[in-house]
């Protein structure tokens, strides 16, 4: 029998040499085909995300498809041979007879493959979305936990203030918030989470112990501690949180705030509408600046905070969200931004020269024994300053957002709700400039930093959503804010790096800035961080404040700085609106900068702990930050300014009447900003119920070893 069996040939009967190919038709046709190489399709190889099942299905389909193609190829060959009159054997004939079937199967398999590939992609997308969602949820949980830690640190820290203690014992409405016993418990607990430096232990170890206490408190464990349990302590702390005591306006400025009221009185009470370009609000120039502490927390009167959404969030919530944002954004080279005095009375001087004179006058006043000039001023030209911290575009003259008033204005009732660019600075509260500073819907007619005037009660609870929404400054948010000149909107400069921390200012990612490439010099040297990440961060701060952590692989442990509430002030410029402010690599101010005080993002390094009594000499060191080369810099050098006396610079040496060696002051380890003198160190200096001398640093050493995420 012609073995028609296996060949499927068709052709010429028995005569003639076997088809040379040995394609024994039938089989080939049968498609049995040797094992086709398994799925070569890209889809099948997407493995990682794809479920195993989908992978296998695609593999099978792929193999089948290739077998069918191979089979069809043979059938075509057989038919061709048949057409030439060549005899096919039975197998080949059988195969040829199935030509249509094979063709149909092939089409079907292709369709199936397409469907499964699409399905596979959908699955992948779904898995990615799910993973992302889970990641966001995890991040959110972490942020909440961090927020709680910061709140806790703030509260514990504040409890060192006698006035606060008294208030809490007396209660706001006569109802005591805490008993003496509870205060004592918190004092005891404070010693655990802010331990004296034990040189027999490694710092790491010491804070590890402290962090365990904090953790157990957060968990509300039933474990005993300080003669009670963490659970009880947690309830006590929560009671304090819920009392909103710290959200209302209390004039506890962590130290001296001597004639605040008088000082800020001259501030214009009502905002000048945008149309009136230069209401000459004056900087109240006080010679007591040195002895004054600045309250960074409560800047803006409620009326001035015209956010799109009016829901209110407990200011704690917001501030910590912001702190978290900034922490998460801790750049690898977290520039040592330090809190600036934030009570600003916007002044729009008509003449740049006048403004410059005013600045110089202020500087002169600040030349007292404390050498008050902030490094941040100097750092503006300092290469060590993080390139990400760049100055903002010159302000539109119409923006009443002038220089910070370097005095301690009354804190009145502006709540601590995260003002742009600032996490509230409690007397020694952790202040981290908000990376996600956004122009929370500030209307154009209102300066970003309002003079702290009347005691307008700021809504206590701005919904976190709202903050988050404004934090994200998505394009939908730009309605109110876009009326501000681009420069006036707080910015998180995340151009090339993920190091916006501490550099509050204009959110370049906000829609209004999308087209303003000139605002920042994208070529400024920055450490090689995941640039694409940061560039993508347009919508990063969304309703769930889900910043991606990927932009900074190592979180610089800036808890120190956080404690310092590193805040920066948007130096409001009154340059012409069209001046695009190009920041060069060395952070020089552009020539157009008409202002005398061109400090957009000037970190002030607030030495919180000093008020506690002791010097915080080591602060700077502990707070080393990553310099431009991503190398860890000790705090001292990191904060040393270098004057670049460029003509553009708002500060040339000549501007200061007395030459001073700023670097010397920097070596103290903390910026001169709030170096307290021999004046009263504020209630915080008091021993706070503990025996022995006052703790030098009640400000919770920030758990330096604890990574945020």
């Amino acid at each position: 029998m012609p073995s028609a069996t296996s060949h499927s040939g068709s052709g010429s009967k028995s005569s003639g040499p076997p088809p040379p190919s040995g394609s024994s038709g039938s089989e080939a046709a049968a498609g049995a085909g040797a094992a086709a190489p398994a799925s070569q399709h890209p889809a099948t190889g997407t493995g990682a995300v794809q479920t195993e099942a989908m992978k296998q299905i695609l593999g099978v389909i792929d193999k089948k498809l290739r077998n069918l193609e191979k089979k069809k190829g043979k059938l075509d060959d057989y038919q061709e041979r048949m057409n030439k009159g060549e005899r096919l054997n039975q197998d080949q004939l059988d195969a040829v007879s199935k030509y249509q079937e094979v063709t149909n199967n092939l089409e079907f398999a292709k369709e199936l493959q397409r469907s499964f590939m699409a399905l596979s992609q959908d699955i992948q997308k779904t898995i990615k979305k799910t993973a992302r969602r889970e990641q966001l949820m995890r991040e959110e949980a972490e942020q909440k936990r961090l927020k709680t830690v910061l709140e806790l640190q703030y509260v514990l820290d504040k409890l060192g203030d006698d006035e606060v203690r008294t208030d809490l014992k007396q209660g706001l409405n006569g109802v005591p918030i805490l008993s003496e016993e509870e205060l004592s418990l918190l004092d005891e607990f404070y010693k655990l989470v802010d331990p004296e430096r034990d040189m027999s232990l490694r710092l790491n170890e010491q804070y590890e112990h402290a962090s365990i206490h904090l953790w157990d408190l957060l968990e509300g464990k039933e474990k005993p501690v300080c003669g009670t349990t963490y659970k009880v302590l947690k309830e006590i702390v929560e009671r304090v949180f819920q009392s909103n005591y710290f959200d209302s306006t209390h004039n506890h400025q962590n130290g001296l705030c001597e004639e605040e009221e008088a000082a800020s009185a001259p501030a214009v009470e009502d905002q000048v509408p945008e149309a009136e370009p230069e209401p000459a609000e004056e900087y109240t120039e006080q010679s007591e600046v040195e002895s004054t502490e600045y309250v960074n927390r409560q800047f803006m009167a409620e009326t001035q905070f015209t956010s799109g959404e009016k829901e209110q969030v407990d200011e704690w919530t917001v501030e910590t969200v912001e702190v978290v944002n900034s922490l998460q954004q801790q750049p690898q080279a977290a520039s040592p931004s330090v809190p600036e005095p934030h009570s600003l009375t916007p002044v729009a001087q008509a003449d740049p020269l006048v403004r410059r004179q005013r600045v110089q006058d202020l500087m002169a006043q600040m030349q007292g024994p404390y050498n008050f000039i902030q490094d941040s001023m100097l750092d503006f030209e300092n290469q060590t300053l993080d390139p990400a911290i760049v100055s903002a575009q010159p302000m539109n003259p119409t923006q009443n957002m002038d220089m910070p008033q370097l005095v301690c204005p009354p804190v009145h009732s502006e709540s601590r709700l995260a003002q742009p660019n600032q996490v509230p600075v409690q007397p020694e509260a952790t202040q981290v400039p908000l990376v996600s500073s956004t122009s929370e819907g500030y209307t154009a007619s209102q300066p970003l930093y309002q003079p702290s005037h009347a005691t307008e009660q700021r809504p206590q609870k701005e919904p976190i959503d709202q903050i988050q929404a404004t934090i994200s400054l998505n394009t939908d948010q730009t309605t109110a804010s876009s009326s501000l000149p681009a420069a006036s909107q707080p910015q998180v400069f995340q151009a090339g790096t993920s190091k916006p921390l501490h550099s509050s200012g204009i959110n370049v990612n906000a829609a209004p800035f999308q087209s303003m490439q000139t605002v920042f010099n994208m070529n400024a040297p920055v450490p090689p961080v995941n640039e694409p990440e940061t560039l993508k961060q347009q919508n990063q701060y969304q309703a769930s404040y889900n910043q991606s952590f990927s932009s900074q692989p190592h979180q610089v442990e800036q808890t120190e700085l956080q404690q310092e509430q590193l805040q920066t002030v948007v130096g409001t410029y009154h340059g012409s609106p069209d001046q695009s402010h190009q920041v060069t690599g060395n952070h020089q101010q552009p020539p157009q900068q008409n202002t005398g005080f061109p400090r957009s993002n000037q970190p002030y390094y607030n030495s919180r702990g000093v008020s506690r009594g002791g010097s915080r000499g080591a602060r700077g060191l502990m707070n080393g930050y990553r310099g431009p080369a991503n190398g860890f810099r000790g705090g001292y050098d990191g904060y040393r300014p270098s004057f670049s006396n460029t003509p553009n610079s708002g500060y040339t040496q000549s501007q200061f009447s007395a030459p001073r060696d700023y670097s010397g002051y920097q070596r103290d380890g903390y910026q001169q900003n709030f170096k307290r003198g021999s004046g009263q160190s504020g209630p915080r200096g008091a021993p706070r119920g503990r025996g022995g001398p006052p703790r030098p640093n009640r400000g919770m050493p920030q758990m330096n070893t604890q990574q945020v995420n």
Epitope: M1, P2, S3, A4, T5, S6, H7, S8, G9, S10, G11, S12, K13, S14, S15, G16, P17, P18, P19, P20, S21, G22, S23, S24, G25, S26, E27, A28, A34, G85, E86, R87, L88, N89, Q90, D91, L93, D94, V96, S97
Partner: antibody, heavy 111, light 112 residues
Framework: SLEESGGDLVKPGASLTLTCTAS?????????MSWVRQAPGKGLEWIAY???????TAYANWAKGRFTISKASSTTVTLQMTSLTAADTATYFC??????WGPGTLVTVSS | DVVMTQTPASVEAAVGGTVTIKCQAS??????LAWYQQKPGQPPKRLIY???NLDSGVPSRFKGSGSGTDFTITISDLECADAATYYC??????????????FGGGTEVVVK
């Protein structure tokens, strides 16, 4: 299926015609119908095939002249055997191509 | 006609073992070769066609290979049911030359 018939006990020198009947299909153009035999305890031996499409036939060298394969109808193929000898004693199978086989029919040549 | 020579005539192997049977054609037949399994009292059952293609329903333990004049079938993971006689057959049909569809002599596989 296929079924062979016509097997019998015959004397040497006799002739015999075997028939292969198809059920469930008819012999259309694309089939080779073959005959194969197997002597008791021996191996398979191909005899001949016919290509139904054009009636072309092929035979094993040893079968030429004594065996003839033909298509009798759309469902039957026959094998005519002449001058049988004892060596022709075997089970005869018909097959379509080489895939489908009948159960075989026994031909015994004996005196 | 082409002559097919099959070796060995008989082979014994244990369950789970492997058996290889060879078939040699007297002239090149390309890949026109089929392998059959036959058990006593039954007609042959084709296992492989075109030298290496498995018929449907045949376990993949059966593997055919070769082309031209030398062919082999390998049965791995032997099972008791594999005990049978195996044949090779030339399945070439060509108008120019008559190859004939000769069978090999067969190989008996005994499974212990």
């Amino acid at each position: 299926s296929l079924e062979e018939s016509g097997g019998d006990l015959v004397k040497p020198g006799a002739s015999l015609t075997l028939t292969c009947t198809a059920s469930g299909f008819s012999f259309s153009g694309s089939y080779y119908m073959s005959w194969v035999r197997q002597a008791p305890g021996k191996g398979l031996e191909w005899i001949a095939y016919i290509y139904i499409g054009d009636g072309v036939t092929a035979y094993a060298n040893w079968a030429k002249g004594r065996f003839t394969i033909s298509k009798a109808s759309s469902t039957t193929v026959t094998l005519q055997m002449t001058s049988l000898t004892a060596a022709d004693t075997a089970t005869y199978f018909c097959a379509r191509g080489n895939k489908l086989w009948g159960p075989g029919t026994l031909v015994t040549v004996s005196s | 006609d082409v002559v097919m020579t099959q070796t060995p005539a008989s082979v014994e192997a244990a369950v789970g073992g492997t058996v290889t049977i060879k078939c040699q054609a007297s002239q090149s037949i390309s890949s026109y070769l089929a392998w059959y399994q036959q058990k006593p009292g039954q007609p042959p059952k084709r296992l492989i066609y075109d030298a290496s293609n498995l018929d449907s329903g045949v376990p993949s333990r059966f593997k055919g290979s070769g082309s031209g004049t030398d062919f082999t079938i390998t049965i791995s993971d032997l099972e008791c049911a594999d005990a049978a006689t195996y044949y090779c057959q030339c399945t070439a049909v060509s108008s120019a030359t008559i190859y004939g569809n000769a069978f090999g002599g067969g190989t008996e596989v005994v499974v212990k």
